[in-house]
Amino acid sequence: QKLSKHKTPAQPQLKAANCCEEVKELKAQVANLSSLLSELNKKQERDWVSVVMQVMELESNSKRMESRLTDAESKYSEMNNQIDIMQLQAAQTVTQTSADAIYDCSSLYQKNYRISGVYKLPPDDFLGSPELEVFCDMETSGGGWTIIQRRKSGLVSFYRDWKQYKQGFGSIRGDFWLGNEHIHRLSRQPTRLRVEMEDWEGNLRYAEYSHFVLGNELNSYRLFLGNYTGNVGNDALQYHNNTAFSTKDKDNDNCLDKCAQLRKGGYWYNCCTDSNLNGVYYRLGEHNKHLDGITWYGWHGSTYSLKRVEMKIRPEDFKP
């Protein structure tokens, strides 16, 4: 459905009337497009969650299901294209195609921004997403990573409420959580997750996941993960897979206990943790005595709080 263009009316006295009609018609068409876009967005959300579930089922069950995954992903891709086209039509913007748009750090990388640091992603007025300050890692494993979480100084408490975890908090150059709403938006295309950790002895480890999706707020920012690779020993995020996000004021865990209050953070608590990357930052000397620290059980166990953690994401199809 395209916005129709009208010629200027011949009679001057009809000009105002025609203009009003034209505006009404345009408004109706924009409203129509908006509701259509809203429906597509909802459908896309539902479809994508089901795609992710299929992906996980495929990877754990058998190879012969791969064609279904391909179908589902192409369906998702097709829907994305439809939405892009509709957005362009409704906003009457032809100056910037979806290929030109800057969505994340990988987009910046492809535009030859190759220095790690703070960048501002432009707002998307049509989708209502504001300007977003992000920290881009343009070096690790090919670059193009958008950092969604960092713990390194311990100067920012992570014992915060649902709204703060939704919107984000902390210093983008220091300790921060980017915000579940932003992370959800960034993971709506097929996305990889990388978790980097450092212990108090200076050892570095990482865990990477072939698929990473954060559901929307209606889904309580549920976590979906694909295959694990890495050198951090046991995969300590798998236990949190397909689990809703919980905070001190919103208990969505799979436990009688309130895990967020026990483990002192906001996280995808199951019952309760195999990892707790948003736990309490303990300094050297206190770092190996507590269950509510920044833990990854598969490496140093349940009472060892790590010195540094970064969580970062980039599109699955990213090519340096």
Partner: antibody, heavy 120, light 108 residues
Amino acid sequence: QVQLQESGPGLVKPSETLSLTCTVSGGSVSSGSYYWSWIRQPPGKGLEWIGYIYYSGSTSYNPSLKSRVSISVDTSKNQFSLKLSSVTAADTAVFYCARAKWEGDYFDYWGQGTLVTVSS
Amino acid sequence: DIQMTQSPSSLSASVGDRVTITCRASQSIYSYLNWYQQKPGKAPNHLIYAASSLQSGVPSRFSGSGSGTDFTLTISSLHPEDFATYYCQQSYSTPPYTFGQGTKVEIK
């Protein structure tokens, strides 16, 4: 040197809405390293945090005031504003705007404060 | 909400005295504690963050200590300009950020 300046009426009638604006100079409300808060102090009493706003428009409010408070930011004017509705005499206080640094979560720069009296 | 309780509410001291103010949290706040000084008719001035880190420009006679629930602000040798009201503030469990009720340091 960062400076903050509160402005708005010094007298508000009960049940009306209190509106204050904080103008920031020597720094930008668009900075991602800080958030911008309102704090009040009733005469002869202690400090009470009202809420904060971040450059992106993200807000957090004191649960005790949540139903009555709204904070907004205007990055083009380098200002942020407070609205407190349905005021009573108990809302009479000196209202401060302040900048808070995320790293350490402390209020490092404050306005000089403005006294708002709620009275008919 | 986490309650912050300061003691004493007020104290009298002389120039040169060592002064100690305590702040107790209703639950552990780890080291997420700040201290402020407020003089009459003025806005508060930040002194210490993370329980013990001195804000730049603050004289070294001010020091902070403690973690968990019990914290202390110490002025090693009281100067005339130090007579003021002191507030502690927690930034661990938010919202809200909560302040102590204040400790007034008066001239003896």
